[in-house]
Interface confidence: medium
C-alpha cells in the first residue's frame, strides 16, 4: 500500500539568465528511495539520482544542470524555453513509484522574484 506523499516547490518563477532549484520531498512513508528521475515537460530526462550509483546528468543538459541540493536539481542559465512542467519521479521499495509536478515560469523581467514554496500537488 502506498502511503507516501510528494511535496514539491509547486509553481515557481525565475528570471531569464538566472537559476532555480527544483525540489521534491517524499514523506509519510518508510519506503526506501532507490532512485529519483527528473524529467522535463517533453518527458526528456534531465537527470537521475540513484541512491547507490550516484548522479547522472544527461549530456544535453550537462552545461546547465547541477545536481542537488539533496535529491533536488538546480537549473542554470535559464531561457524562456525552460518554461513548463518538470516532474520528479521517486522509485521506491517496496511502495513503487511516486511522482511530483513543478511548474516553472521563466520571466523576462529583471524584477522577477524567485518564488518557491512547498506544496502537495
Amino acid at each position: 500500500m502506498m502511503t507516501g506523499t510528494i511535496e514539491t516547490t509547486g509553481n515557481i518563477s525565475a528570471k531569464k539568465g538566472g537559476s532555480v532549484i527544483l525540489q521534491c520531498h517524499l514523506s509519510s512513508t518508510m519506503a526506501q528511495v532507490t532512485q529519483v528521475n527528473w524529467e522535463q515537460h517533453d518527458h526528456s530526462l534531465l537527470a537521475i539520482r540513484n541512491a547507490e550509483l550516484g548522479w547522472h546528468i544527461y549530456p544535453a543538459f550537462k552545461d546547465r544542470v547541477a545536481p542537488g541540493p539533496g535529491l533536488g536539481l538546480t537549473l542554470q542559465s535559464l531561457t524562456m524555453n525552460d518554461t513548463g512542467e518538470y516532474f520528479c519521479t521517486y522509485h521506491t521499495y517496496p511502495d513503487g513509484t511516486y511522482r511530483g509536478r513543478i511548474f516553472l515560469e521563466v520571466l523576462e523581467s529583471s524584477v522577477a522574484e524567485h518564488s518557491a514554496r512547498f506544496q502537495i500537488p
Epitope: Q32, L45, E52, H56
Partner: antibody, heavy 127, light 107 residues
Framework: EVQLVESGGGLVQPGGSLRLSCAAS????????MSWVRQAPGKGLEWVAN????????YYVDSVKGRFTISRDNAKNSLYLQMNSLRAEDTAVYYC????????????????????WGQGTLVTVSS | EIVLTQSPATLSLSPGERATLSCRAS??????LAWYQQKPGQAPRLLIY???KRATGIPARFSGSGSGTDFTLTISSLEPEDFAVYYC?????????FGGGTKVEIK
C-alpha cells in the same frame, strides 16, 4: 558502510559438498537481491547464482543447476551457497555480491548491477 | 546465453595514453551493460552501469558508450592505478554473463 564477508571455503574432494556463507552488514539486507560470482585461478569472472530480496526467485548458471542452491536468511543478514557434487572445475574464488538497482524509465524495468562485493573465499576441489 | 567478447585480450600502453576497450554481445543487450575493474588479489569494482553512466566516485577519465551489441570503455588518459583487468557484464537477462576481460598493462 556496506560490508560483505564470505566464509566456508576450503579443500574438498570431487563429489563432496561445501556450504558458503556471506555475512552482510551496513544496509537493509532484506531490501536487496544478492548474487554469487566466481573466478577460477587466473581466469575471468563467472556469475553463478542470484536470489531476489525475499528469496522467491532464484537463478543459476547452467553448469551448476541441480548441484548448487542459493538461499538467504533475512533475519540473520546472511546469504548462502550450498554446493553439492563438486567438480574440479568448480575450483575458484567465490564472491558474494550485492545488487544496486537502476530504474530504466524508457523501458519501465529495473536493472541490477553489482556495486558491492566481498573479498571472496577460495574453494578448491581436488583429490 | 548471451556471449560477450572483449577485445583486445591485452592492451600495452604507457601512462598518459588513451585506452579503448571493446565489448561485443552475441545479441542485443540494449543498454544493460556494466564495466568492472579488477586488480590482482582484489574484488571487482563497478565503473560504468547502463553502458554509459559512471558509478559513484569513478573519475571522469572513465567513460562508456554503445548500445545493442557494441560497447566501448574509454580511459582518456591512463593513470598508474588504471593498469588492471577490465570486464564487461550484461544484465539484460539471466544467465548474467561477463566478457573474458581485457588486461591493460604498462608498456
Amino acid at each position: 558502510e556496506v560490508q560483505l564477508v564470505e566464509s566456508g571455503g576450503g579443500l574438498v574432494q570431487p563429489g563432496g559438498s561445501l556450504r558458503l556463507s556471506c555475512a552482510a552488514s551496513g544496509f537493509t539486507f532484506s531490501s536487496y537481491g544478492m548474487s554469487w560470482v566466481r573466478q577460477a585461478p587466473g581466469k575471468g569472472l563467472e556469475w553463478v547464482a542470484n536470489i531476489k530480496q525475499d528469496g522467491s526467485e532464484k537463478y543459476y548458471v547452467d553448469s551448476v543447476k541441480g548441484r548448487f542452491t542459493i538461499s538467504r536468511d533475512n533475519a540473520k543478514n546472511s546469504l548462502y551457497l550450498q554446493m553439492n557434487s563438486l567438480r574440479a572445475e568448480d575450483t575458484a574464488v567465490y564472491y558474494c555480491a550485492r545488487v544496486s538497482y537502476y530504474y530504466d524509465s524508457s523501458k519501465l524495468r529495473w536493472a541490477e548491477y553489482f556495486q558491492h562485493w566481498g573479498q571472496g573465499t577460495l574453494v578448491t576441489v581436488s583429490s | 546465453e548471451i556471449v560477450l567478447t572483449q577485445s583486445p585480450a591485452t592492451l600495452s600502453l604507457s601512462p598518459g595514453e588513451r585506452a579503448t576497450l571493446s565489448c561485443r554481445a552475441s545479441q542485443s543487450v540494449s543498454s544493460y551493460l556494466a564495466w568492472y575493474q579488477q586488480k590482482p588479489g582484489q574484488a571487482p569494482r563497478l565503473l560504468i552501469y547502463d553502458a554509459s553512466k559512471r558509478a559513484t566516485g569513478i573519475p571522469a577519465r572513465f567513460s562508456g558508450s554503445g548500445s545493442g551489441t557494441d560497447f566501448t570503455l574509454t580511459i582518456s588518459s591512463l593513470e598508474p592505478e588504471d593498469f588492471a583487468v577490465y570486464y564487461c557484464q550484461q544484465v539484460h537477462n539471466f544467465p548474467l554473463t561477463f566478457g573474458g576481460g581485457t588486461k591493460v598493462e604498462i608498456k
